[in-house]
């Protein structure tokens, strides 16, 4: 159930159409989870500052049941910062990503939970 959320001050017009599909496929590969369980949410046009500057930036979160940990998170950071730089022109040093290892019982889906 990986769920990736990007809040950014980059305008909607600057988010390419292929971005959501690409994020989905890349996260599926990186987490080893099926693409049909990957959810991505890009929230553009936000009023944001990073280090006191309103240059392009992003505040992100990746929730997953397992597949979260020190080495894995470093790998995800490299992948996701790369995509945010390449597609949204956000410098990697203006990105924060919070990682959440979810308990299956605390994630609802399809009238139940993953527990």
């Amino acid at each position: 159930m990986p769920m990736f959320i990007v809040n950014t001050n980059v305008p909607r017009a600057s988010v390419p159409d292929g971005f959501l599909s690409e994020l989905t496929q890349q996260l599926a590969q990186a987490t080893g989870k099926p693409p049909q369980y990957i959810a991505v949410h890009v929230v553009p046009d936000q009023l944001m500052a990073f280090g006191g500057s309103s240059e392009p930036c992003a505040l992100c979160s990746l929730h997953s049941i397992g597949k979260i940990g020190g080495a894995q998170n470093r790998s995800y950071s490299k992948l996701l910062c790369g995509l945010l730089a390449e597609r949204l022109r956000i410098s990697p040093d203006r990105v924060y990503i919070n990682y959440y290892d979810m308990n299956a019982a605390n994630v609802g889906w399809n009238n139940s939970t993953f527990a």
Partner: antibody
């Protein structure tokens, strides 16, 4: 008006060097990622080099065919980008275009210069 | 490297006709595709980006479609100013390769 203007082309012998310049105006140059693209009858349109903005550490990238021979650089204070070419070969002959994106609208090559012609021949 | 295969290489059509140019990528490039028009002796001009979004000032007689590996550019009701060469280009990753071009000529 958004404008890019290339200069520095001409005739050069194989093995020689040449420096192309591109002057930009009408947009926030410091935010833009800049590119060189060339065109020849033999190879068609071919991306050559890329230089990112200061926010992205002026990172540079090159086509495999020019790596180690060409160097892209920029001077944000002069709103200019350069392409230093060395060890030139006949296959480097073509029209060299400076291109970029109109920052904040799309990330594609929507701004092009008129091009400058480079001929590598003895 | 991703290869972009454009077809046809050349096309002859009359004013008022509708034509379609296709572009195939050697691997999935999502919607990271642009189309350019180039007139003789001029630099390329952006027509379409993100496979289907018309660039500023481009008339609605042009339309782009496709995603993944198969893309097309359709021009309806051809006008004299539409004749020239057309190129596709992917923006998925370096090198940003172009198609070989389609030369559109007046019949």
């Amino acid at each position: 008006e958004v404008k890019l203007e290339e200069s520095g082309g001409g005739l050069v012998q194989p093995g020689g060097s040449m420096k192309l310049s591109c002057a930009a105006s009408g947009f926030t140059f410091g935010d833009a990622w800049m590119y060189w693209v060339r065109q020849s009858p033999e190879k068609g349109l071919e991306w050559v080099a890329e230089i990112r903005s200061k926010a992205h550490n002026h990172a540079t990238y090159y086509a495999e065919s020019v790596k180690g021979r060409f160097t892209i650089s920029r001077d944000d204070s002069k709103s200019s980008v350069y392409l230093q070419m060395s060890s030139l070969r006949a296959e480097d002959t073509g029209i060299y275009y400076c291109t970029s994106h109109h920052y904040g609208s799309s990330w594609y090559f929507d701004v092009w210069g008129a091009g400058t012609t480079v001929t590598v021949s003895s | 490297d991703i290869q972009m295969t454009q077809s046809p290489a050349s096309l002859s059509a009359s004013v008022g006709e509708t034509v379609t140019i296709t572009c195939r990528a050697s691997e999935n490039i999502y919607s990271y595709l642009t189309w350019f028009q180039q007139k003789q002796g001029k630099s390329p001009q952006l027509l379409v980006y993100d496979a289907k979004t018309l660039a500023e000032g481009v008339p609605s007689s042009f339309s782009g479609s496709g995603s993944g590996t198969q893309f097309s550019l359709k021009i309806i009701s051809l006008q004299p100013e539409h004749f020239g060469s057309y190129y596709c280009q992917h923006h998925y990753g370096r090198p940003y390769t172009f198609g070989g071009g389609t030369k559109l000529e007046i019949k």
